[in-house]
């Protein structure tokens, strides 16, 4: 139900709270217009209703909130702050709601929020403090355990003059608030690289999905700290080869399963270590499906069937013998 008391003692980072107050107390736990509510299932669904704001009168019992397929555009600070707070809200799905701006403190005052899905929103402006709620160097820990950010890359003409990867990573690392995060999905975001410090600061990760990006190399990425990692999805990227350091780190993770399908593997002399490792390791799922993309003579060859004689590099000619 809606708050009815003054919000003056509340954080100023939640300006919406103070004004989202019904003039008269609504019926207890009534369902907002355009939404479907099940108190038994603790679920509210406001789906495909072209909402431009988060409903103000959300029932206090809500544990699962679906706000998918709307036109929210912007989530301001305190977008879900209510009096009394939505203390039970554990799963929030905002996918496909045309969000392009998520501000600092957008998810403040949701003490039980464990799952957040922002997928399929063109997030041109994701505040570094969207998840941490404050610009302190160390923030209060976020309760988030699962963060789904698949296909949040905006169209190229709407991206700002900054690295999209950098913007996302800044939000993930701010204030070290997401130390308890166990699942992170970042699929389909056109990532060209993975900033080297991101994984080291998310030590609780069990599941990491980076599939359908444009990652060319993992050379500078360290998986060493991710001792709990159970699944690593790297399908449909632009990976050419995994080098020894990466192979050793992956092999050293006790529970890991790695998915590497549909990458343009380059089967030359630099691939020898990876082929040897693939033949011995159990961590790669569907490793028998991995095939060469380059060079042309090796296209569609199965990596597991290669031997060292297959993996050669064209000799580099001295400059005096190179033609222009």
């Amino acid at each position: 139900s809606s708050p009815t008391s003054s919000a003056s003692s509340f954080s100023s980072s939640a300006p919406f709270l103070a004004s989202a107050v019904s003039a008269q107390p609504p019926l207890p736990d009534q369902c907002p217009a355009l939404c479907e509510c099940s108190e038994a299932a603790r679920t509210v669904k406001c789906v495909n209703r072209n909402l431009t704001e988060v409903p103000t009168d959300l029932p206090a019992y809500v544990r699962n909130l679906f706000l998918t397929g709307n036109q929210l555009a912007v989530l301001p600070a305190g977008a879900f702050a209510r009096r009394p707070p939505l203390a039970e809200l554990a799963a929030l799905n905002l996918s496909g709601s045309r969000l392009d701006e998520v501000r600092a403190g957008a998810f403040e005052h949701l003490p039980s929020l464990r799952q957040l899905d922002l997928s399929h929103n063109p997030l041109a402006d994701l505040s570094p403090f969207a998840f941490s709620g404050s610009n302190a160097s160390v923030s209060a820990p976020s309760p988030l355990v699962e963060l789904i950010l698949n296909h949040i890359v905006p169209p190229e003409d709407e991206r700002q003059n900054r690295s999209f990867e950098g913007m996302v990573v800044a939000a993930l690392l701010a204030g070290r608030a997401l130390q308890g995060l166990r699942r992170l999905e970042l699929a389909s975001n056109h990532f060209l690289y993975l900033p080297r410090d991101v994984l080291a600061q998310l030590p609780s990760l069990r599941h990491l999905d980076l599939s359908n990006n444009s990652l060319v190399s993992l050379t500078y990425v360290s998986f060493r700290n991710l001792t709990h990692l159970e699944s690593l999805h790297l399908e449909d990227n632009a990976l050419k080869v995994l080098h020894n350091g990466t192979l050793a780190e992956l092999q050293g993770l006790p529970h890991i399963r790695v998915f590497l399908d549909n990458n343009p593997w380059v089967c030359d002399c630099h691939m020898a270590d990876m082929v040897t490792w693939l033949k011995e390791t159990e961590v790669v799922q569907g490793k028998d499906r991995l095939t060469c993309a380059y060079p042309e003579k090796m296209r569609n060859r199965v990596l597991l069937e290669l031997n060292s004689a297959d993996l050669d590099c064209d000799p580099i000619l001295p400059p005096s013998l190179q033609t222009s």
């Epitope: 300006p15 989202a20 217009a33 406001c46 409903p55 555009a73 912007v74 392009d100």
Partner: antibody, heavy 120, light 111 residues
Framework: EVQLVESGGGVVQPGRSLRLSCAAS????????MHWVRQAPGKGLEWVAY????????YYADTVKGRFTISRDNSKNTLYLQMNSLRAEDTAVYYC?????????????WGQGTTVTVSS | DIVLTQSPDSLAVSLGERATINCRAS??????????LHWYQQKPGQPPKLLIK???NLESGVPDRFSGSGSGTDFTLTISSLQAEDVAVYYC?????????FGQGTKLEIK
């Protein structure tokens, strides 16, 4: 042509109530959020309240919170403002206005206003 | 609450001359996606009318002698060549957060 026509204003004593209406025509009323904005005599503009297109969101200025209630009836293309416990400082011309959304929107159509005078 | 301060409070400009009105916000009202600042014109005895949305976008039907600029905290409304019908009070308004607030208004007259 977009038209917004306010009614229901008048002279009322402090502590009493009044209900304003705003009749909309010339556009699909149910697709737009609506605001009330007021203007005290000789003064500037003051935002009062907002209601979303489907009555899922309601916001109020601190000066009216707990006393005023905004509502709408999309079947009648009408916006309402129920004003209780009126005070002298509520004396103003009250305008209804249309918007496409709360934050990403703006007041792109206005009514002519209705005058509320709170006086003993 | 965000305070919008307009300057000057009143302005007298000759016909055909340029008129400039400023609006300063007490905090930024721009993001990299959108600028949450709009301008209105109110003639005597009439309701306000939207002139400029999102700092610089001319509302349909508004003469192109009106223009807006600015971002962050500082914004400007310019009338490039003042006409007699431009005599009015001009207001800026933000939509960054609740409560929405207006500037105090600038009264524009003909010199």
């Amino acid at each position: 042509e977009v038209q917004l026509v306010e009614s229901g204003g008048g002279v009322v004593q402090p502590g009493r109530s009044l209900r304003l209406s705003c009749a909309a025509s010339g556009f699909t009323f149910s697709n737009f959020g609506m605001h009330w904005v007021r203007q005290a005599p000789g003064k500037g503009l003051e935002w009062v309240a907002y209601i979303s297109s489907g009555s899922t969101s309601f916001y109020y200025a601190d000066t009216v919170k707990g006393r005023f209630t905004i509502s709408r009836d999309n079947s009648k293309n009408t916006l309402y403002l129920q004003m209780n416990s009126l005070r002298a400082e509520d004396t103003a011309v009250y305008y209804c206005s249309r918007t496409n959304s709360l934050l990403r929107g703006f007041f792109d159509a206005w009514g002519q206003g209705t005058t509320v005078t709170v006086s003993s | 609450d965000i305070v919008l301060t307009q300057s000057p409070d009143s302005l007298a400009v000759s016909l055909g001359e340029r008129a400039t009105i400023n609006c300063r916000a007490s905090q930024s009202v721009s993001s990299s996606s959108y600028t949450y600042l709009h301008w209105y014109q109110q003639k005597p005895g009439q309701p306000p009318k939207l002139l400029i949305k999102s700092a610089s976008n001319l509302e349909s039907g508004v003469p192109d002698r009106f223009s807006g600029s600015g971002s962050g905290t500082d914004f400007t409304l310019t009338i490039s060549s003042l006409q007699a019908e431009d005599v009015a009070v001009y207001y800026c308004q933000h939509s960054w957060e609740i409560p929405l607030t207006f500037g105090q208004g600038t009264k524009l007259e003909i010199k």
